[in-house]
């Protein structure tokens, strides 16, 4: 019985739970998901039972062995998977545990602007990047393009300080999770700060 294997899948995609068995005379293999039986295989009996009908179209054995492939993944497929290999040649079953995390493909992140001020010809504000549907395990980074050196900033909030007369800058939020990444629409510093340009001491949301 090896250490827990961590697997990652994407909604609509597929994942294979790898199983290499050295057991010679296998009586049965039982795959379970969160303690619910998923598949039972009795190799010599020629028996393959997929416990729930809704999984019959999603289960496969891809490598000519006992590895399990689960396709058309859904968010609620995330959880603990467990396989037991039972054999009269073993005093106790050979087991392996897996943890599956299923993530959604990220949609375009949304950017909101915080309170904006324009003092002494410098536009100061915060840009906040977020996912509209509250997806899990999202990491945000910002790319600032247009100055001598392109810059990166980690985190969902980007503090901006842009002086009128400087070359224009473009800000892009990059949202990442373990299965995908997506980009916000580019935001131009000049456009962003135009609202505060008329009044050098104004602040706006």
């Amino acid at each position: 019985s090896g250490p827990v294997k961590e697997l990652v899948g994407s909604v609509g995609g597929a994942v294979t739970f790898p199983l290499k068995s050295k057991v010679k005379q296998v009586d049965s293999i039982v795959w379970t998901f969160n303690t619910t039986p998923l598949v039972t295989i009795q190799p010599e009996g020629g028996t393959i039972i997929v416990t729930q009908n809704r999984n019959r179209e999603r289960v496969d054995f891809p490598d000519g062995g006992y590895s399990l492939k689960l396709s058309k993944l859904k968010k609620n497929d995330s959880g603990i998977y467990y396989v037991g290999i039972y054999s009269s040649s073993l005093q106790q079953p050979s087991t392996q545990e897996y943890v599956l995390h299923v993530y959604e493909h990220l949609s375009k992140p949304k950017v909101t602007m915080g309170l904006q001020s324009n003092k002494n010809g410098t536009c100061v504000t915060n840009l906040t990047c977020c996912m509209e549907h509250g997806e899990e395990d999202v990491i945000y980074t910002w790319k600032a393009l247009g100055q001598a050196a392109n810059e990166s900033h980690n985190g969902s909030i980007l503090p901006i300080s842009w002086r009128w007369g400087e070359s224009d800058m473009t800000f892009i939020c990059v949202a990442r999770n373990p299965v995908s990444r997506n980009f916000s629409s580019p935001i131009l510093a000049r456009k962003l700060c135009e609202g505060a340009a008329d009044d050098p001491d104004s602040s706006m949301v």
């Epitope: 295989i41 009795q42 010599e44 028996t47 393959i48 997929v50 496969d60 054995f61 054999s87 009269s88």
Partner: antibody, heavy 117, light 107 residues
Framework: EQQVVESGGGLVQPGGSLRLSCAVS????????VIWVRQAPGKGLEYVSI???????YYASSVKGRFTISRDTRLNTVYLQMNSLRAEDTAVYFC???????????WGQGTLVTVSS | DQQLTQSPSSLSASVGDRVTITCRAS??????LSWYQQKPGKAPKLLIY???NLASGVPSRFSGSRSGTDYTLTISSLQPEDFATYYC?????????FGQGTKVEIK
Amino acid sequence: EQQVVESGGGLVQPGGSLRLSCAVSGFSLNSYGVIWVRQAPGKGLEYVSIIGSSGNTYYASSVKGRFTISRDTRLNTVYLQMNSLRAEDTAVYFCARYYGDSGFDSWGQGTLVTVSS
Amino acid sequence: DQQLTQSPSSLSASVGDRVTITCRASQSIGSWLSWYQQKPGKAPKLLIYGASNLASGVPSRFSGSRSGTDYTLTISSLQPEDFATYYCLGASPNGWAFGQGTKVEIK
């Protein structure tokens, strides 16, 4: 070389019993499973029962409760005890070695069982 | 319910023809499928095991493949000795199951 020979077939009345034998040589029953398959006259092949290498037994639903598969590893023989026989059990009965990977590689020539009054 | 659906039930072909026989499983059975040739009055003979592995002593014109739950036996160039009935055998929820058989006859 692996060899498989069936015996014990014959004519039996409906409701009667018969025991078929499958004598194997060239391999050990502790290492390989043995399957029984039958073929009614002019029909296709039908799975009947299998005994695994560790002695586990499995049956087709059509014979479950009426047929019993067993083995004697010292005599290298697999048996199929058939009780409550019906006319539809009339067939040539084959036994074969389970090679693994769903393959049955050594077959006997078959023994004919006729259930008739 | 039929666990393995074999098609066609019969076909006529000539020597040298390419012949394809298909077996469809009612659910995924991985590679737990084999193919057999049977001649009248004889025992079945193993051709392919594990869906695509050629059995010992079987000519290379026989091959097996799998696509999802569809399994195919192909005879690349039919020979006179290949006229016979072919069966698939596979795993199922109820244990081993045979296809209905395909009789390959001379055209």
